[in-house]
């Protein structure tokens, strides 16, 4: 075991938060301020990410882990590790090259991000529109017109479609 250890790269003993310093006979030196090493055995440290401008610091950089950013109010994160911040819009709007624009008739957006999506076409499922859609909300589809006809023999009308995760009242 001792022989194996002596044959190992001495840098493998340097823990996270340090780098293996070739200028000092491969001793472990602490990462300079504003830098980090998240794994052991590194020959250099990495520059800390700086959360500037529209980015906000969610987690400070330490000698062993990079800073993490999120976005200032009015913006939301995009991309891996919040690599970009995109402007929020209101519900009923979408972000275009010219800024936030209202959803066109027949489309909706119930979030502050993303694009306007078409209302559900109830007739494709043989159903009727129970509640009309708006710029902020999708239509609510109800029972099919046949279920509502006077001669329908069904004793109990079908339960309206429930959103996932909602329990019946």
């Amino acid at each position: 075991f001792e022989r194996t250890r002596s044959l190992q790269d001495p840098c493998s003993n340097c823990p996270a938060g340090t780098f293996c310093d070739n200028n000092r006979n491969q001793i472990c030196s602490p990462c300079p301020p504003n830098s980090f090493s998240s794994a052991g055995g590194q020959r250099t440290c990495d520059i800390c990410r700086q959360c500037k401008g529209v980015f906000r610091t969610r987690k400070e950089c330490s000698s062993t882990s990079n800073a993490e950013c999120d976005c200032t109010p009015g913006f939301h994160c995009l991309g891996a590790g919040c690599s970009m911040c995109e402007q929020d819009c209101k519900q009923g709007q979408e972000l275009t090259k010219k800024g936030c624009k209202d959803c066109c008739f027949g489309t909706f957006n119930d979030q502050k991000r993303g694009i306007c999506r078409p209302w559900t076409n109830c007739s494709l499922d043989g159903k009727s529109v129970l509640v009309n859609g708006t710029k902020e909300r999708d239509v609510v589809c109800g029972p099919s017109p046949a279920d509502l006809s006077p001669g329908a023999s069904s004793v109990t009308p079908p339960a309206p479609a429930r959103e996932p995760g909602h329990s019946p009242q």
Epitope: F19, N23, S29, P32, P33, N34, T44, I47
Partner: nanobody, 122 residues
Framework: EVQLLESGGGLVQPGGSLRLSCAAS????????VGWVRQAPGKGLEWVSA????????YYAESVKGRFTISRDNAKNTLYLQMSSLRAEDTAVYYC???????????????RGQGTQVTVSS
């Protein structure tokens, strides 16, 4: 050739003050990220303070905040560390250090001087 020459160390009583100096040659101090590291007896190196982002920000280790002040005189190409309210645990060899940013994105530092011994004892 890059050189860093530290001076100003000595024996001081607890609660006392010292000012360390680091005269730099072979590079312009104001254009670099520079600072002070120390090595206490039987321990590894520890960052004490640094001037970063070409003077845009300063760094202090938690253990010295409010007691030590880093500064530089660009005309004299000299870095200083004003140390006050000194404690026994500040006893160490203090080195002037230059942060090096490598082309591949890595960061290391370089200490070229012999360091200056600071001993805090009654």
């Amino acid at each position: 050739e890059v050189q860093l020459l530290e001076s100003g160390g000595g024996l001081v009583q607890p609660g006392g003050s010292l000012r360390l100096s680091c005269a730099a040659s072979g590079f312009t101090l104001s254009a670099e990220d520079v600072g002070w590291v120390r090595q206490a007896p039987g321990k590894g190196l520890e960052w004490v303070s640094a001037i970063l982002d070409h003077g845009g920000s300063t760094y202090y280790a938690e253990s010295v905040k409010g007691r030590f002040t880093i500064s530089r005189d660009n005309a004299k190409n000299t870095l200083y560390l004003q140390m006050s309210s000194l404690r026994a645990e500040d006893t160490a060899v203090y080195y002037c250090a230059r942060v090096i940013y490598h082309a591949g994105g890595g960061v290391t530092f370089d200490t070229r001087g012999q360091g200056t011994q600071v001993t805090v004892s009654s």
